[in-house]
């Protein structure tokens, strides 16, 4: 997190706000609800209280405007700048302005007013942009989904560095951004994609370029807004320029950042029995056209060419790949070796000699 220079903050805990005008894109009630919810994000984790005024001067004046709107920081028409807010202080201090050339919504269409307001009110309270891609105060807008919003840990640390913690946090679970060099790091899924490696963990993935040590961290939804926040398994089908993503009983086929028509589908359509609730890991072998699908302590082999599950499956993981344990969290194949991830450990397994040749920390894939 980052605070503004000179640690600008309010010297009182009871703050007022006023909605000066409204966007035509939403009902008054929807706008009021979005702003109330956005303030609650911050009051839940601090001693701050927010009270709405209907007239007069409030600490935080909220308005919608277009282009030059009275503060010498003009908006720019659709897209580009969504809004801005001033750090704590007198006059303009704390005020938040929203570009009414955007389409404001309470969904994923256009721009989600609650999400942008929560970010802007972070500025109104003294937070600058964060370098943590999981933070609400990260400068890039990402719609994070319909489920209950949870303020990320980085933002909690930031706002509490200014105002301290509140009495009782009603939502004490604050998602942390994974640390790639945490020795206990386990991974959710791994796949190649157009020559790069995508390593999924929680709401994020690391994107690792070949011959590069520094993996970039992204929110999964910043690339694929329609996917769930977390995924279970993934594999690439390079000859078709597709990747397949699994979550629960559903799976998606993606070309770049586009979901193919007809997806998501049910994993039972692949020939898996109905009692299989999720795929924990998947890996595709381009030379044979086969894909291994792991669930629990079992493995299935799917024929991607003929779209049929191979006979004699499922089999026990321990029988087919002795020594790797009875579950697989993530898996990928490279140069004749399969890399199986089980908790914080990965096993390098030789296809040629059918045995484990190396055991390494899971995060060595991230050059830790």
């Amino acid at each position: 997190y980052n605070v503004f220079p000179r640690t600008l903050k309010w010297s009182k805990m009871n703050l007022t706000y006023r909605i000066v005008n409204y966007t035509p894109d939403m009902t008054h009630s929807e706008v009021e609800k979005a702003f109330k919810k956005a303030f609650k994000v911050w009051s839940d984790v601090t001693p701050l209280n927010f009270t709405r005024l209907h007239d007069g001067i409030a600490d935080i004046m909220i308005s919608f405007g277009i282009k030059e709107h009275g503060d010498f920081y003009p908006f720019d028409g659709p897209s580009g700048l969504l809004a801005h807010a001033f750090p704590p202080g007198p006059n303009y201090g704390g005020d938040a302005h929203f570009d009414d050339d955007e389409t404001w919504t309470s969904s994923s269409k256009g721009y989600n007013l609650f999400l942008v307001a929560a970010h802007e009110f972070g500025h109104s309270l003294g937070l600058d942009h964060s370098k943590d891609p999981g933070a609400l105060m990260f400068p890039i807008y990402t719609y994070t989904g319909k489920s209950h919003f949870m303020l990320p840990d980085d933002d909690v640390q930031g706002i509490q560095s200014l105002y301290g913690p509140g009495d009782e946090d009603p939502n004490p679970k604050h998602p942390k951004t994974p640390d790639k060099c945490d020795p206990s790091l386990s991974l959710d899924a791994i796949t190649s994609l157009r020559g790069e490696t995508m390593i999924f963990k929680d709401r994020f993935f690391w994107r690792l370029h070949p011959q590069q040590v520094d993996a970039e961290l992204f929110l999964t939804k910043s690339f694929w807004p329609e996917l769930p926040n977390r995924i279970d398994a993934a594999y690439e089908h390079p000859s078709h320029d597709l990747i397949f993503i699994f979550r629960g009983r559903k799976f998606w086929a993606l070309n770049g950042y586009d979901i193919l028509e007809g997806y998501p589908k049910k994993i039972s359509e692949l020939g898996l029995p109905k009692e299989v609730k999720k795929i924990s890991a998947a890996v595709h072998f381009e030379d044979t056209g086969k894909t291994l699908l792991f669930s629990g302590n079992q493995v299935w082999r799917y024929d991607d060419t003929n779209h049929i599950m191979d006979k004699d499956y499922p089999r026990l993981i321990e029988e087919d790949f002795p020594g790797i344990g009875d579950k697989v969290d993530a898996v990928y194949e490279k140069n004749g070796y399969i890399y199986f991830f089980n908790g914080p450990i990965q096993f390098e397994y030789s296809i040629w000699s059918n045995r484990i040749v190396r055991v390494m920390p899971a995060n060595s894939i991230l050059w830790c």
Partner: nanobody
């Protein structure tokens, strides 16, 4: 780094048509807006047509009804179909893309430009 490559410019008579295309080589980097601007000699660069962040289209008044912007998401490509071209449409046409930011300026990504000349 987003790289934009335009094609389709050329010399055309008044009343004629051209189709410009712009391809973004981005891997799977998500683009927010993508569209076309133009710059006539001695003038500033102006918006012609763009896809906004919410998938709507926006056109300059001077091209409405004559130009149509379209795109192919799978290919990260945007097109500009220009009909009933006029001499005043003569300009270098630039492809433009941005990413979504909250309140700081998005990086602007520009193509090299393709020349369109309307003359008899």
């Amino acid at each position: 780094e987003v790289q934009l490559v335009e094609s389709g410019g050329g010399l055309v008579q008044p009343g004629g048509s051209l189709r410009l295309s712009c391809s973004a080589s981005t891997g799977i980097f998500r683009i927010n807006t993508m569209g076309w601007h133009r710059q006539a000699p001695g003038k500033q660069r102006d918006l012609v047509a763009t896809f906004t962040s919410d998938d709507n289209t926006k056109y300059a008044d001077s091209v409405k009804g004559r130009f149509t912007i379209s795109r192919d998401n799978a290919e990260n490509t945007v097109y500009l179909q220009m009909n009933d071209l006029k001499p005043e449409d003569t300009a270098v046409y630039y492809c433009h893309a941005t990413t979504v930011m909250y309140d700081s300026n998005s990086p602007d990504y520009w193509g090299q430009g393709t020349q369109v000349t309307v003359s008899s």
